[in-house]
């Protein structure tokens, strides 16, 4: 806390300018009129202030709107948003897009904090769903924005703000994430011919279905080995020798190196060893010839 | 009066990770972000990491990326950089400094860290 | 990124002579900038912020000014401990960066 004194004669600020640079802490909360702050924000930016200058204007700030800054105030913020904490932040009202694109631009190349995770929850809720300009902007600046979401807020975002997303956007996703955005995606490309389709939906399809997967199959997609390996390994497991053939194309010869891991593993597990065999890879492990094989869960589907 | 103090440099191989200390005195530590710099050998200064007095900000210099991390104990008054997957062009001496927004107003005396086979 | 770049790389000058050592910012940097001078084996040490502020203990015969783009530090007569490299450096934005060096050597 900045203790009270007079302004000393003639420092009395009469603009926000680059004078102030060279004033104390306590000059600065004595002769800095809160209200000339507020009005002149977009000037503060210009000025290279101390971040212990900064402080006092933000204590300013704060005095003078003790209920949240305004969005005209907020908008300006620049340099001083990196000295607001998440409390201050959830004060706010953020309701425009371009407010938004200001702050965050102020912390571009920094590692998500907890005030850009308040202010991005803050303008998201504010707007009701995560729209697709919205989403736009967020994945611009932070790509992996969306593999930071629940399962339950990324049911919030519509089938048409998909097309925003791209590739890397995703990296980060788990399986449950996944299953939420692939129906989105399915619907939001499904206007789309065969390898467009399968161009757009490929990031999406750790949360494909099997029947989705014996779909893709029929299509001459040639899937690569790093999209089949990032599937579900229960959407995987079913799938014939010939269906994954069809699948992956020319990359199935891929399989081998990835014999060992799930989910060419588990797979490798469920299949007959002839049926392995006519890939001509020498894949191991399949069940052998002449055993047979029972689906129990079929079974105790049944009983 | 204000010191800054760096320690943990030394040899490593290519790939191989390393902890820097910075001790600070003679000021209150938790009121401050601070710095990481670097120099490589014969060569100008880069600025590759900084934190805010509560940690809650931060910044990593693209070169540093995924493989730097930047901490702080402000019971300790202490800050630190743990360096993971070093490559050769990381040799530098490595500076701890003040940081006050506009510039740097303190620094340490660098400790050096060579990356070699 | 803003590149800083500093000329003249290096300058050999004697001791009374006035220095003008120059920054150019690839963009507007306001007055965001500070001066720093190294000693061989030395951390650098702060001179001028907000490109004219001189700290407090650095003698009156360093300056600093200019604002935008274009910015110099004058040595206004060279004294004996005043040959060092000397950096720019800017912080209008992330991440911050600074100039190659001027070296300062006795002629």
């Known amino acids: 806390e900045v203790e009270k004194t007079a302004c000393p004669s003639g420092k009395k600020a009469r603009e926000i300018d680059e004078s102030l640079i060279f004033y104390k802490k306590w000059e600065l909360e004595a002769c800095v009129d809160a209200a000339l702050l507020a009005t002149q924000m977009d000037r503060v930016n210009a000025i290279p202030f101390t971040y212990e200058q900064l402080d006092v204007l933000k204590h300013k700030l704060d005095e003078l709107y003790p209920q949240g800054y305004p969005e005209s105030v907020i908008q300006h913020l620049g340099y001083l948003f990196l000295k607001m904490s998440p409390e201050d932040i959830r004060k706010w009202n953020v309701t425009s897009l371009e407010t938004l694109k200001a702050l965050l631009e102020v912390n571009k190349g920094h590692e998500m904090s907890p005030q850009v995770a308040t202010l991005i929850d803050r303008f998201v809720k504010g707007r009701g769903q995560l729209d697709k300009d919205t989403l736009d902007t967020l994945t611009a600046f932070y790509p992996g924005y969306l593999c930071s979401l629940s399962p339950e807020e990324l049911s919030s975002v519509p089938p048409s703000s998909i097309w925003a997303v791209r590739p890397q956007d995703l990296d980060t996703c788990d399986p449950r994430q996944l299953d939420v955005l692939y129906p989105k995606a399915r619907l939001a490309f499904q206007n789309m011919n065969g390898s467009e389709y399968f161009v757009k939906i490929q990031s999406f399809l750790g949360g494909a279905p099997t029947e989705d997967l014996k779909a893709l199959s029929q299509q001459n997609v040639s899937m690569d080995l790093a999209t089949f390996m990032k599937l579900r390994t229960d959407a995987v497991l079913p799938l014939t020798v010939a269906e994954v053939q069809k699948l992956l194309g020319p990359h199935v010869e891929g399989l081998k190196a990835e014999e060992r891991h799930r989910p060419v593993r588990d797979w490798i597990l469920r299949q007959r060893q002839d049926d392995l065999d006519t890939l001509g890879l020498g894949l191991q492990g399949g069940i052998p010839n002449g055993y047979l094989v029972l689906d129990l869960s079929m079974q105790e589907a049944l009983s | 009066q204000v010191q800054l103090v760096e320690s943990g440099g030394g040899l490593v191989k290519p790939g191989g990770s390393l902890r820097l200390s910075c001790a600070a005195s003679?000021?209150?530590?938790?009121?401050?972000?601070m710095s990481w710099i670097r120099q490589a050998p014969g060569k100008g200064l880069e600025w590759i990491s900084y934190?805010?007095?509560?940690?809650?900000?931060?910044y990593y210099v693209d070169s540093v990326k995924g493989r730097f991390t930047i901490s702080r104990d402000n019971a300790k008054n202490s800050l630190y950089l743990q360096m993971n997957s070093l490559r050769a062009e990381d040799t530098a001496v490595y500076y701890c400094?003040?940081?006050?927004?506009?510039?740097?107003?303190?620094w340490g005396q660098g400790t050096l860290v060579t990356v070699s086979s | 990124d803003i590149q800083m770049t500093q000329s003249p790389s290096s300058v050999s000058a004697s001791v009374g002579d006035r220095v003008t050592i120059t920054c150019r910012a690839s963009q507007d940097i306001s007055r965001w900038l500070a001066w720093y001078q190294q000693k061989p084996g030395k951390a650098p040490k702060l001179l001028i912020s907000?490109?004219?502020r001189l700290q407090s203990g650095v003698p009156s015969r360093f300056s600093g000014s200019g604002s935008g783009t274009d910015f110099t530090l004058t040595i206004s007569s060279l004294q004996p401990e005043d040959f060092a490299i000397y950096y720019c450096q800017q912080a209008k934005s992330f991440p911050r960066t600074f100039g190659q060096g001027t070296k300062v050597e006795i002629k």
């Open positions: 934190i805010s007095s509560s940690e809650s900000i931060i």
């Open positions: 400094a003040r940081d006050v927004g506009s510039h740097f107003d303190y």
């Open positions: 003679g000021f209150t530590f938790s009121d401050y972000y």
């Open positions: 907000a490109a004219s």
